[in-house]
Every structure is written in C-alpha cells, then in structure tokens.
C-alpha cells in the first residue's frame, strides 16, 4: 500500500481540505520534471524560470546565459535548438497544432557570435519541421511537403523534393496514420551521424480514402476538414524511403532503399530508421498483416552512390500467437562493432526481453530474462547497457533503470534506482549525456516527481535538478486519497488494480465505486506513478472509490495476457473488468447499487461495451470520444489487433465487436455519450453511430458534443467536460451537489 | 542575364595537362543556388559529365575520369576551372561549362563550348 | 552506370509533322530524366526537365512524358528550327549519362 504523502497529526487534520474540482481544472496540484537538453557529455541547456537559455557544465560547475530571454521576446519564441557547432541558434515562434505530434511553426536563425539575427535567405513559413545537422550547421527543413536543405544558416536553399502536394504526397513529414500509428513523430527524416546523408519517407496518400467533418469556426459557413485517413481495410500510403547525399544535394536524384523481397511481395509499412555509421543504415519494415517484421542493413556503395541492402543482413522477426512487438516493433540499438545490435522481443517464455544479435536472430544471445519484460533500452556504452524493466518485487506497474556490464564477462547487472528513494520512487525514466558520461533520472512517483543528476560510471547523484518543493508545500494541508496497487488472482490471470480510496476509508462502511477503464492493447493503467487529477478529487471530496484494472491485452506482464486479446477486441477487456468489480464487491465496502465506469478513447469502447454487458452491475457509465466499431477506425492500429475486416479474414469479429451490435442492452443503465465534433483521431461517426443505434433502439441516453474539439478535448472544454461528467457521476450516486 | 564563357588553349600535346576556364557574367558562383559542371563532347563518345563544383569548394567527377580530374572555383574572379591530367587522343572533344540546377532542373545554361583537341 | 538508349538513331520528318523520341534507361531513373536540344555548331539547351516539365521559354509543342526506363519526347508540329539532334540525361544516378541522341532531319 502506497500513502502519499505521509499523515499529519489528527490534531492538524481541522486545518486540511479535500480537494476541489477547481483545483483540479487550475492545475493547482501539477509537478515539473527536469530533462538536460544535452549536448555533449558533460554539458546541458535548459531553459530557466525567466526564459534564458542556460549551459551547464557539470564538470566545472560553471553555467552561462547563451541566450537572453530579451532575444526570445523579440520574436516571441517558445522553444530553441542550439546547432552542434553552437554558431546558431534556431528560435521557434507561432507554434500552430495540427495532430498529436505534429505543428507548424515560424523559425528564426540567431548568429550567436554576432548577436545578430540571420538576415537573407529567410526561411520560408509556416515550416512544417525543421532541425540541424548532428555535426555542424547544416539545417534540414520541411515546407508544403517538400524538404530543403541549407548547408549554412544564410545561404539559400537546395530544394532536395519538388512533388510534395498537401494531402497527396507528404516528403520528410508523416501523414495522419504514420504519424498516429506508426512513428509517433512530427518527422520522417533522419540525419546520418555526421551529416554527411540524409534519409527521409515520402508518403503517398493519393488512393486513400478521405475522412471529411466540418469545422464550425465562426463564419457564415463551416469548413471542412479533409484527412487521407485509412480505415481498417483501405487503401494505405504507400512509402518510399530516401537518401540524399548532403555534401552535393540534389545533384543527382534521391537514392531509394530497396525493400526486401519477403516484404514487398505484398501491402507492407516502413516502421523505422536507425542510422548505425555514416555508411551503413538499418530499415525495418512490417507486412501490413502485422506479424512479420524485416530489420534491414544497408550500406553505401561508394562507387555507384547507391545503398545495398543485402539478404544476409535482413532478421526476421515473427509472432506465432499475436502481432509483432508491444504497440510497436522494437527498435535496434548498434553496438560499437556497427554490425551487432541489442534489441528488445519476445523469449521462448513469451516475455519480452533484452536479445544480442550478432549475426542472425535464431542465433541471438538473451541477456535479460525471467517473469518480468525489459521495457526500453536507453544507451550501449563500450561496456554499459542501460534499461529499463519492471523486475523489482515484481510489480509489473514500476520502472526502474538497470546498469549490465557488457565489458566484462558473465556481464553483471546492477539495478540503478530500485533502493535510491524506495517508498518515494518506483517509476523512472532516464535521459543520458554523450557517451553515458551523466544521466539524469526522472522519478515520476508514487510520490512527488523528482529529477536527479547522476555520474554516469560510480552511479552516484551529483544534484537534485527539481524536487517540487512547492508542490509538496501546496500539499500540506490537502487530504489526499490513500492508493493501494496489488492483485487479484482469477482462472489462472492475474489482475492488477489500483484503488484509490477516500482520505477517511472505513472498511467497514459502503462507498461508490466508479471503475476507470483505457484497456487497450499494450496499454498499463495500473503504474506506480503520482497524479492529482479528477479522480483524486472524487475519492477525495466525494468520498467515491476508484479502481482501474489491468486486464488482458495490457502490457508487460509477457504475451500470454498481451496477446489474448488478438482478433477479439471487446471481449476480454470488458470481461476483466467485470470479474474485477465482482471481486470488489466482495471485499465488502462497495455499494453494490452504486457502480459506475468510465473511460475515454479506447476506454469508452470498454466502458460502452461493459456497460452494455447485461450483468446489471453498472448503474451508470461515461463514455468519452469512444471508438463504438473497429470498422470506423485507422488500419495501422485495428489491423495489428484484428486483421482485416474481410470475409475471409476477421470480418465476423468486426460486426460482433461493435457498440451498436448491443443497442438495447443499455436500457437499464445510465449512459452518458460525449465526443469532439473536430476529432480527428476517433472520429465524431463514431459516437453518431452509437446515438443512432440507441434512438433506433428507443433507448433514453444522455450526449454532450463539443463543437470544433479534438480528441483531446482541450482548452474550456476540459473544465466543461469534467464539470459535466461529476455532475453526472454525483446524480448517479445521489450525492449532494 | 547568365553567360557562361569558356577559355583556354585549344591544342593540348599528350600526357600534359588540359586547362580550361569558364567565366560567369550577370550571375555569381558563389550564389548556393547552383552547381557549376563541365560536360564534354567528342565524336566517339557523345555527351559526356565531367563534374561538378559548388561555391564552397565541393565537388564530384564522373568515376571514369575521376582520377584525372580536378576541378576548382576562385569567386573572387567569379570563374571556375577543369584540369584534365595525362590526356590522350580520346580527350579531344568539345568541353562546355554550365550552370547546373540540379536533378529536378537539369543544366538550364551552357556556354558556347570550346574545342580542344589533344595532339603531338 | 545507367545507359541511356534513344531511339530513332535518326528521324526524317516533313515540317508540321509530329516527332516521337524515346529514351529507353538500363533500370529505374523515377522521373529525374531532361531532353536537351542541339543545333550544329551550339551548346545543348534545355528542352524538359523532370521528364514531363517545359524549361523557360521552351514552346507548347514541345512536351516530355514517362517514368522509370522509358521516356518520349514529343514534338507535336514541326517548325523548321525544331531540326535538330536531340539528347535525353538521367539525374537518378552516378554518374549522371547522356543518351547518343536522336538526330531530327528534313524529309
């Protein structure tokens, strides 16, 4: 059991509050973290209070001002990026979403040594990416889907693509789907160690099919958003990938990489790129049947200017019991010998874990294993590999960074952070300098977030970078929930929970429960991690207990619960989460007529679904931007889970699995509907479809739509939405406003 | 607008060395807009690459010459310049300098080409 | 190296009538490919570029077309300076090569 933080003395509990839903929603309880933006081993910018750009060196201990906030004023910049040989400095203003990664922004070149700015030759705007060279000054930008690329600040550029057309052909940058499903990135360009090549995806979305939603705005007539949005079994982009020669640019055509053979033969994805050498590049690739994934290495052919990717240096990657990789295939990380790699996937035993392959993947040696998964590598050193895992006491929702000497032989592993702050900090991650010489470790909980600086060799803390003193100090006098994470045991599955219970929990009275659902594939909810959100404020102020439940699909707890759910969504999630309440329930303090679920995105799927269950444990249930029928949604993401939605393949599946499917079923429950109109992620048809199929059914439900919002729900729709949704949950549970 | 001027001399004796010189008016070689190439034609073989240059001294040459082959820039005189070593009979041709856009817009100016022939 | 293959050798044509080039690559060029025109005693002039795009002050009759290995030139009515010999270039590649050129004579 996790209390956070520690009691006062019951005779200054009259002085502490609960926490209110206006805190919640000011953001009044948020904490900082502190990641160095390296750049070297033992030098760091960061940004400070009043807006300076600082370097640190660790070494010395010395810091100066390398850039004044006066300057970022001046163009009202919001973010900066320092070029490698540190003569410039890029200043990024009118910063202008588009999807989850992805923004348009004006950039501005400053000349540190002149303390000017770059004057002509301007860069054009709005740019949709933009970033330096790793050596030098050369900068490599996207515009209306064309790359250019300046071999100095102030010289004019090279265009390096002429057939990039919005919506059509995306060159350097992903479209909606790559972006979402696949890189997760802004980019699609990626720069060889000493930027001598520049490799980057042209994506061609001309056959895809479009999503189309109005966008209300404020004039007479609304516009219309277009997207090329692939759905489950539509016409995909078809990738390319690209090398230019940097040192004489668009001299001639760009290089293409060839695709392998075993890859190619049918609809396939580009999934990553990972330069090893300036002359050697690794490709991997995935059949759009997403159970087949190809690491291809290339190299440069010095005498034809080409890239050769030979068979001998394709592995195969393949999953006989689910898709290839967690969300996404794992990527290499080279060693020194620029042939071998350490990579992350499955072991005989179903758990995913650290593999060396030095020649073919059959032959790869396994560095980590046992009854707990590797979850990201962070550097190889000569002699260091640095992860992270949820080994420790075998709590798959923690994270700790270990240390395996890989210089020395049996290679010994040390665990870096598991006893550092054992009751504050169970949840890491890591940021490391060149060559592993500093790292900082980023504690995220279960008590209040702190950020350290580490020596890379002894392992020791050098400083604290930020503690959240203030925050700790806000949180004197707040009655914060108790939270509790174990496990029930269930036919053989374990399912964790945590439980969130009110600050003055009696076991021996009844509380509501209100069950919080997200549940997709390779998702965790179950996390040793601090938050005071919405739900802290429900167990806090409304005295309402909540659980959020890991069941199978989840993640890092080895492919037997992961890949359960392949080919049938909507069926194990939902049946998890009601043996979980039964459960509940029968440890005696919940009010069994007052249970309720909610979830957002593919939460709301659940929630519907469970809700929609017939077991008659819920009376009431949110569903927030839900996905109500895998049909609606993006093929990278339904088709690693589903296959295709075809005769022959899982189409039956697809049908069954639906929210309309289970209209009437949700006769006796209270079902409140909400979605963004401008959502272009889980699209608006989604909810439409559901408020159908219930009017169609003659079934009484409650919506609320918010007009030109995303997935997100950001902005005043926030406060509305969790104003709204308490009011609901406080209705249901007949709680007093 | 843009000219390009070819100069040198037009008789070459075996195994000395070709050079030749293209002067650029009404345009500068050191605008990072363009790469500056020399091409050759001779009866047997056609049009041929020779190489490129670019204002910041970079440059890459048909492999099949590469040996031989050096091309360099002066901006302050605004000219660039081709010397082919060791040259044979084979090397007679007419040599032309252009200015050169790149892949996507080809050598969009030439000069008039100067005719060199290579004999004893 | 790509090899460029154009055909015609030579092409004898009344003015008015319609020319058809083509260029044929040893492998993929994508659509980095440009036509040059020569004329006795000239430098070659840049007709197309990108294998379907008019260069500056080059006229409507003339027009380029293809992707990957084969490439045509098209002029669609002769005019007495058309007559000429006409190169194709590849750019895909090191080392960029010429084609031998297609000559384009009186009838």
């Known amino acids: 059991i996790v209390l956070r933080p520690s009691r006062v003395h019951n005779s200054e509990e009259n002085t502490m509050r609960a926490l209110t839903l206006k805190d919640i929603l000011n953001g009044t309880f948020s904490y900082k973290t502190f990641f160095p933006n390296w750049i070297s081993g033992q030098e760091y910018l960061h940004q400070s209070a009043d807006n300076n750009i600082v370097l640190y060196n660790i070494e010395t201990g010395q810091s100066y001002t390398i850039l004044s906030n006066r300057t970022m004023k001046s163009v009202n910049a919001s973010n900066y990026g320092l070029s490698p040989d540190r003569q410039f400095v890029y200043l990024e203003s009118d910063y202008s979403k588009l999807w989850r990664y992805s923004y348009t922004a004006t950039y501005y070149i400053y000349d540190l040594s002149n303390g000017e700015f770059v004057r002509g030759n301007e860069l054009p705007r709005p740019i949709q990416y933009l970033c330096w060279s790793p050596v030098g000054s050369k900068l490599a930008y996207v515009y209306q889907n064309n790359i250019y690329l300046k071999q100095r600040p102030g010289d004019p550029p090279f265009q390096i693509t002429f057939n990039g057309r919005e919506n059509k052909i995306f060159n350097g940058i992903p479209d909606w789907v790559y972006e979402e499903e696949m890189l997760a990135t802004k980019y699609a360009l990626w720069w060889s160690p000493n930027g001598k090549f520049l490799a980057y995806a042209e994506f061609n979305d001309t056959d895809i099919p479009v999503i189309a939603y109005s966008y209300y705005g404020d004039e007479q007539y609304p516009r219309t958003i277009n997207i090329p949005y692939p759905k489950a079994g539509a016409k995909n982009p078809v990738v390319r990938i690209f090398i230019i020669d940097t040192t004489y640019p668009a001299y001639v055509g760009p290089q293409e990489v060839p695709v392998p053979a075993m890859i190619a033969s049918s609809d396939y994805y580009f999934s990553w790129l990972t330069w090893v050498t300036d002359e050697r590049v690794c490709l991997q690739w995935l059949k759009r049947v997403q159970n087949v994934s190809v690491l291809s290495i290339c190299d440069f052919r010095e005498d034809w200017q080409t890239w050769d990717c030979p068979k001998t240096q394709e592995h195969i990657e393949e999953s006989r019991t689910g898709w290839a990789g967690g969300f996404f295939v794992s990527t290499p990380v080279f060693s020194y010998d620029a042939i071998s790699y350490y990579k992350i996937f499955s072991d005989k035993d179903g758990y995913k874990h650290i593999h060396y392959i030095k020649d073919t993947v059959e032959n790869a040696i396994q560095i980590t294993s046992g009854k707990w998964e590797a979850i990201n590598i962070f550097r190889v050193t000569q002699d260091s590999l640095f992860y992270s895992s949820n080994e420790f006491e075998e709590y798959p929702g923690r994270r700790n960074i270990y240390r395996i000497s890989i210089g020395s032989y049996p290679p010994s592993k040390k665990c870096v952070t598991c006893h550092l702050r054992k009751e504050r900090c169970q949840y890491y991650t890591a940021s490391f300098s060149d060559y592993a010489k500093y790292y900082a470790l980023v504690c995220y909980g279960p008590g209040i977030p702190i950020s350290t600086l580490h020596d890379g060799r002894t392992d020791q803390e050098i400083k604290i970078l930020e503690e959240n003193k203030e925050l700790e100090n806000a949180l004197k006098n707040i009655q914060l929930p108790k939270e509790e994470i174990k496990k029930l045991e269930v036919d053989e599955i374990t399912l964790w929970y945590k439980m969130i219970l009110p600050p003055q929990f009696d076991r021996s009275k009844k509380y509501p429960l209100l069950i919080q659902v997200y549940g997709g594939p390779c998702s965790q909810s179950v996390r040793s991690v601090f938050a005071v959100n919405w739900i802290s404020y429900l167990a806090s102020k409304e005295g309402m207990v909540i659980a959020l439940v890991d069941g199978r699909g989840t993640a890092f707890q080895g492919d037997k619960l992961l890949y359960a759910v392949y080919r049938k969504l909507g069926v194990y999630e939902v049946e998890d989460q009601i043996t979980a309440v039964r459960k509940f329930i029968e440890m005696g303090f919940i009010d069994e007529k007052r249970i309720a679920i909610w979830g957002w995105s593919y939460g709301g799927y659940v929630s519907s679904l469970a809700l929609a269950s017939g077991t008659g444990l819920f009376k009431c249930g949110i569903a927030v931007a839900p996905v109500s029928s895998w049909e609606y949604y993006a093929s990278v993401y339904t088709e690693r889970f589903m296959g295709l939605p075809t005769k022959d393949d899982n189409l039956e599946h697809y049908k069954n699995s639906t929210v309309m499917a289970r209209a009437e079923y949700f006769r006796n429950v209270d079902y409140l509907l909400i979605h963004g109109t401008a959502d272009d992620n889980v699209h608006f048809q989604n909810s439409a479809q559901i408020a159908k199929a219930l009017v169609n059914a003659q079934v009484d439900f409650q919506a609320m739509w918010y007009s030109d919002q995303n997935h997100g729900l950001s902005g005043l729709s926030t406060n509305h939405l969790y104003t709204h949704m308490t009011h609901f949950l406080k209705q249901c549970f007949s709680l007093s406003d | 607008q843009v000219q390009l001027q070819e100069s040198g001399p037009g008789l070459v004796k075996p195994s000395e060395t070709l050079s030749l010189t293209c002067t650029v008016s009404g345009g500068s070689v050191s605008s990072g807009s363009y790469y500056w190439s020399w091409i050759r034609q001779s009866p047997g073989k056609g049009l041929e690459w020779i190489g490129f240059i670019y204002y910041s001294g970079n440059t890459n040459y048909n492999p099949s010459l590469k040996s031989r082959v050096t091309i360099s820039v002066d901006t302050s005189k605004n000219q660039f310049s081709l010397k082919l070593s060791s040259v044979t009979a084979a090397d007679t041709a007419v040599y032309y300098c252009?200015?050169?856009?790149?892949?996507?817009?080809?050598?969009?100016?030439w000069g008039q080409g100067t005719t060199v022939t290579v004999s004893s | 190296e790509i090899v460029l293959t154009q055909s015609p050798a030579t092409l004898s044509l009344s003015p008015g009538e319609r020319a058809t080039l083509s260029c044929r690559a040893s492998q993929s060029v994508s659509s980095y490919l440009a036509w040059y025109q020569q004329k006795p005693g000239q430098a070659p002039r840049l007709l197309i570029y990108d294998a379907s795009n008019r260069a500056t002050g080059i006229p409507a009759r003339f027009s380029g077309s293809g992707s990957g290995t084969d490439f045509t030139l098209t002029i669609s009515s002769l005019e007495p300076e058309d007559f000429a010999v006409y190169y194709c270039?590849?750019?895909?590649?090191?080392?960029?090569?010429f084609g031998q050129g297609t000559k384009v004579e009186i009838k």
């Open positions: 270039q590849q750019r895909s590649n090191w080392p960029p090569t």
């Open positions: 252009a200015r050169d856009r790149g892949y996507y817009y080809g050598m969009d100016v």
